[in-house]
Each structure stands twice: as C-alpha cells, then as structure tokens.
Amino acid sequence: SGTTNTVAAYNLTWKSTNFKTILEWEPKPINQVYTVQISTKSGDWKSKCFYTADTECDLTDEIVKDVKQTYLARVFSYPAGHVESTGSTEEPPYENSPEFTPYLETNLGQPTIQSFEQVGTKVNVTVQDEWTLVRRNDTFLSLRDVFGKDLIYTLYYWKSSSSGKKTAKTNTNEFLIDVDKGENYCFSVQAVIPSRRTANRKSTDSPVECMGHEKGESRE
C-alpha cells in the first residue's frame, strides 16, 4: 500500500464555537483519503475520522475532556481504497495543525436574550445560558458553568426613537437597568471574555429584541 500518489493535507484550521470543535483542511481528495489524530502535549495520539473522504473532522468529543488542555492534531493522507496493513512500514504523508487550547480559543456563540421584564422604571433583561458539550459528572455544562466569572455580557440598550446605545455589563446572565417611563427600548447583548488577548474576545451580537414584542412583559 504505497503512498506515492498522495499529497499531504494543508491549511489545517480549527473551527470552534462554544466548544463544538471541528478541524478543517485542504485539499479536496482526489484518489486519497484521510485519517486524523489528536493528542494533548503530553498524551498519546488518538485516531479519529478513519479513512474519510471529507476535509473536516469533528473533534469535540476529545477536546471537551479537558478544555484547558492544549491540543495538537495531524492529518494523514492515504491512497483511496487503503486498507490497514501490518506489512506497511512507509509512513504516510501528514501535516500538523496549529496548537489549540479550547478554553482560550473557542469562539463565543451568538447569545440570545431569553426575556425582559419592566417594573416601573427598571427593566430586568435575562440572557439565555447556552449549553455546551462539556461534561462534568455526566452532566452537560452551560457556557456560564465552564467560564464562570471570566464570561461577561455587555448589554446595549436604546430608546426605539433614538440611535445612541447605552451599555451595561454583568458577570451573571441578568441585567437590571434604569429606563425612562413611557419609553420603548430595544436590547442586544454581546458575550465577552475580557481576559483574552486574542481576536475572539467578543461574540457576535444577539438578535435585537424590543419592548412591545412578545419576549417582554411590563408591570407597573
């Protein structure tokens, strides 16, 4: 089972949001297939996505075991129709991925405003806590469970009649803000991990929710 006609994978890229983590690479295979291996810096290699014709491999199950570890993956190229053979000593071409530390590098998914409630001149805005595939004691953890106080939310709020966006911040999933009586407000939230120094400190903004629509309620 020679590897003379296979080309090494390239452009290995981690795509990760809220710990759902996929390794992507090129090229689209012509007469070849791929197998992925992943390990921590000090651990053994584990094979995934055996002899696949895809150019991506979902590695979520592996990285959620310890999201604070640093992982390395590699993609091996084999001829199409390759069958594992004990007699083969030739190592297939492979390419290493960049290192990936999920806790520091997973992108923050778009948050959702769960509800808002007005009581007089106060509005309580609640952000939905997203579930992740990270587990502790056989229980799936939420984004807040994983990041704790490292995760904050920035609320943008503005009068429907105005464009200027005021801000508020919380390290829980709730905001309590002052509003002008009789005015309708709109809201959008953004997840932020301020301690990150990289280009993924912020999530995309949530969809805008406005008072007078079904998500909110008002009490005097």
């Epitope: 200027g164 966006k165 390290n171 953004q190 932020v192 400190r201 912020k202």
Partner: antibody, heavy 120, light 107 residues
C-alpha cells in the same frame, strides 16, 4: 505593546469641521471599545463618546450629540472623531482611550492627545 | 447621568505626607470606579480600578477604598513624582463620568 496615537488636531474657525484619527497598535480595536475624552485648557476631563468597532454602536455626550460622529475602520485599526459645527467651547485636547471592557477595568490605555483650537 | 463629586479641588502637601482624596457618586455605582493620575501636558494614567485594585506597575503607596457611594484614593507617603492632578471616574453606566479633579501641589 499597546499604543494609541491621535492626529488631526489644529486651528479651525467656529462652525468649521475637523476629523481626528486614533491609530491603534498592539491590539485589535474590534475586540475592545474606543472612547474619546477631551480636556479644555486648565479644566478637567470630559467624556465625549464611545464606539464598539465590532458592531458600530456609539453613544455621545449631550454636549456633542448631533455635531460629532465617531466611526472606526477595523481594516486600518483606527477610530475617528468627526467634529462638525465646532464652537469655541470645543477647544480642548482630545484623547482616545481603550476600554478593556470588563466590569472591573475601563479605560486602561490612552493616547497622547491632540489639541483642537476653535477660534476666529 | 451619575455625578462624581470630588474633593478637595486642590491640596498642598509635603513629601512623606499621607494624602486622601474622596469622590462621592450621586447613585450606586457598585465598585465600577477608577482613579487616574495626570501630569501637565500628559495623558491620564490608570492607577486604581474596581475601586480598590492597584493597576499593573503602580507603586503600592497608592490605594483605593469604597464605602457605599463614597470612594477614596490614598497616597500613604507622598513622593516628588506624585505631584499631579487626580481624577475619579465611574463606568457603571453610560455615560461614564469623571470627578472634577484634585490638584496635589507642593507645600
């Protein structure tokens, strides 16, 4: 190293316009917030406005609302303050500052400032 | 808008003196208060964040505290390089607001 450098200040007549720039290095502005703060000669600090360059959201002090516009070009890692209908009371040193964006830390890095003088 | 009332507006002190500057917020701002030092012709520099935390590289003679809506900046032993103007700032709500400043001069 985080750095903010303002430019574009100068002498302008009342009613005139000026655009200030705030060039950032050492960090990506879209992942933070940029504020403008001014200081009239011999006076204290006055907040002017902010932008979230990630989504373009802004908010302004009442004293400049409708006259000043903050924008950002993330490809140039630069924020701008467009000042129109300038008045004598807008004379000040204008600083841009980075907002770290946490509950605990706000304006952690400031530029050196640029002087705007509004006079006939 | 939240008002930050800072006092005194100026004070004279000698090297080695203990100096206290106060700021009162017009409503609750939690601990979202920072203190800045500014020297003539220079930009403000962050000294204290979150009411009582010393910013990186700032000498330990500077400290901050909070009691309700009252915030205090203390310089335990004034040094020659500490003669400057000090500002408090709240960032609890938009717009953020500054105190009027306290000029610390040599006696």
């Amino acid at each position: 190293e985080v750095q903010l450098v303002e430019s574009g200040g100068g002498l302008v007549q009342p009613g005139g316009s000026l655009r200030l720039s705030c060039a950032a290095s050492g960090f990506t502005i879209s992942q933070y917030w940029i504020h403008w703060v001014r200081q009239a000669p011999g006076k204290g600090l006055e907040w002017v406005g902010y932008i979230d360059p990630y989504n373009g959201y802004t908010y302004y002090a009442d004293s400049v609302k409708g006259r000043f516009t903050i924008s950002a070009d993330t490809s140039k890692n630069t924020a701008y303050l467009q000042m129109n209908s300038l008045r004598a009371e807008d004379t000040a040193v204008y600083y841009c500052a980075r907002d770290y964006g946490s509950l605990r830390v706000s304006l952690d890095y400031w530029g050196q400032g640029t002087l705007v003088t509004v006079s006939s | 808008d939240i008002q930050m009332t800072q006092s005194p507006s100026s004070l004279s002190a000698s090297v080695g003196d203990r100096v206290t500057i106060t700021c009162r917020a017009s409503q609750d701002v939690n601990t979202a208060v920072a203190w800045y030092q500014q020297k003539p012709g220079k930009a403000p520099k962050l000294l204290i964040y979150s009411a009582s935390f010393l910013y990186s590289g700032v000498p330990s003679r500077f400290s901050g505290s909070r009691s309700g809506t009252d915030f205090t900046l203390t310089i335990s032993s004034l040094q020659p390089e500490d003669f400057a103007t000090y500002y408090c700032q709240q960032h609890y709500t938009t717009p953020p607001t500054f105190g009027q400043g306290t000029k610390v001069e040599i006696k």
